[in-house]
Interface confidence: low
């Protein structure tokens, strides 16, 4: 009686169970009544990551420097290449198919979280008492100068984009 189902790591073909090829190898020919499945290792630039009956290995992902990508982890016969972005860039998607420059936080905003290879800069508005007068991908909001600690008084109030201006106290005669 020919089988209708096969064991794990086998597949059914021509009414018989053949062994699947192990990760890192592709199928060259199915098994027969007399011969085992013939498998062949993937070439240097290819991979297969599961027990399979694929006749072609998958090409390793190309981390295209034209798109700002670089290799984070080189692929093996069993794993794909993992790409990341060059310094100053981050991925446009989870699969990291291309990169874009990190965003700068405009004046009035500070960096809440510095960008990484996979995430953009996160900016936050400078709260009262803090300011940022630069467009930067690194600078946090800075606190207004404390005039009192310098024995000075506030001559001009600070904003989210400007520091306070301190000046001497009016001395009454």
């Amino acid at each position: 009686e020919p089988p209708t189902a096969c064991r794990e790591k086998q597949y059914l073909i021509n009414s018989q169970c053949c062994s699947l090829c192990q990760p890192g190898q592709k199928l060259v020919s199915d098994c027969t009544e007399f011969t085992e499945t013939e498998c062949l290792p993937c070439s240097e630039s290819e991979f297969l990551d599961t027990w399979n009956r694929e006749t072609r290995c998958h090409q390793h992902k190309y981390c295209d420097p034209n798109l700002g990508l670089q290799v984070q982890q080189k692929g093996t016969s069993e794993t794909d290449t993992i790409c990341t972005c060059e310094e100053g860039l981050h991925c446009t998607s989870e699969s990291c198919e291309s990169c874009v420059p990190h965003r700068s936080c405009l004046p009035g905003f500070g960096v809440k979280q510095i960008a990484t290879g996979v995430s953009d800069t996160i900016c936050e508005p400078c709260p009262v008492g803090f300011f940022s007068n630069v467009s930067s991908a690194f600078e946090k909001c800075r606190p207004w100068t404390s005039c009192e600690t310098k024995d000075l008084v506030v001559q001009q109030a600070g904003t989210n984009k400007t520091d306070v201006v301190c000046g001497p106290q009016d001395r009454q005669r």
Epitope: S45, C63, D64, N66, L67, V71, K74, T92, E97
Partner: antibody, heavy 120, light 112 residues
Framework: QVQLVESGGGVVQPGRSLRLSCAAS????????MHWVRQAPGKGLEWVAV????????YHADSVKGRFTISRDNSKITLYLQMNSLRTEDTAVYYC?????????????WGQGTLVTVSS | DIVMTQSPLSLTVTPGEPASISCRSS???????????LDWYLQKPGQSPQVLIS???NRASGVPDRFSGSGSGTDFTLKISRVEAEDVGVYYC?????????FGPGTKVDIR
Amino acid sequence: QVQLVESGGGVVQPGRSLRLSCAASGFTFSSYGMHWVRQAPGKGLEWVAVISYEESNRYHADSVKGRFTISRDNSKITLYLQMNSLRTEDTAVYYCARDGGIAAPGPDYWGQGTLVTVSS
Amino acid sequence: DIVMTQSPLSLTVTPGEPASISCRSSQSLLYSNGYNYLDWYLQKPGQSPQVLISLGSNRASGVPDRFSGSGSGTDFTLKISRVEAEDVGVYYCMQARQTPFTFGPGTKVDIR
């Protein structure tokens, strides 16, 4: 200034092998992808192969796949093209070229070329 | 593979006059980052090719501003605003969108 100097060309019989070299100077070789492009006598340009800066990725045109292999030695600042099972239709001037990177994808600086003649 | 075509294949121009070369690709060269992966090259007689335009419209370093590139997707144009004697040679477009990179057949430009 960027300089690329090819060598290794010559006359060779069909079925034989040849290895072309390209010596680079004037830029950080290990940071750039490199190409081979060829031009048959009186014909247009044909892209042959590209290799990434750290050698993890290489691609070849279908017309040379399985016969030609692009490689590089960053310590020697040299690009190579190993050509096996040569055919008469491989007769061409072979140029090595630097890849321009993110701002200028594709070959941006080219060598002067080396002539390969496959003839019996 | 992406197939590149050019027109015209031959062009004779008068010095000082403008010239225009068209290049078409069988697939879009516009990538998700907004750039068109098309380059223009000039091969002067007896010389190696030199890059004129990258990413469809970016003039390469040292290239005179009489050269300009335009277009998007599958249709591209190289324009020379005022042709000079030194502009003679064969002009090629090339797609760098995906491997294998492919060149157009070339456009031969002569001076009248």
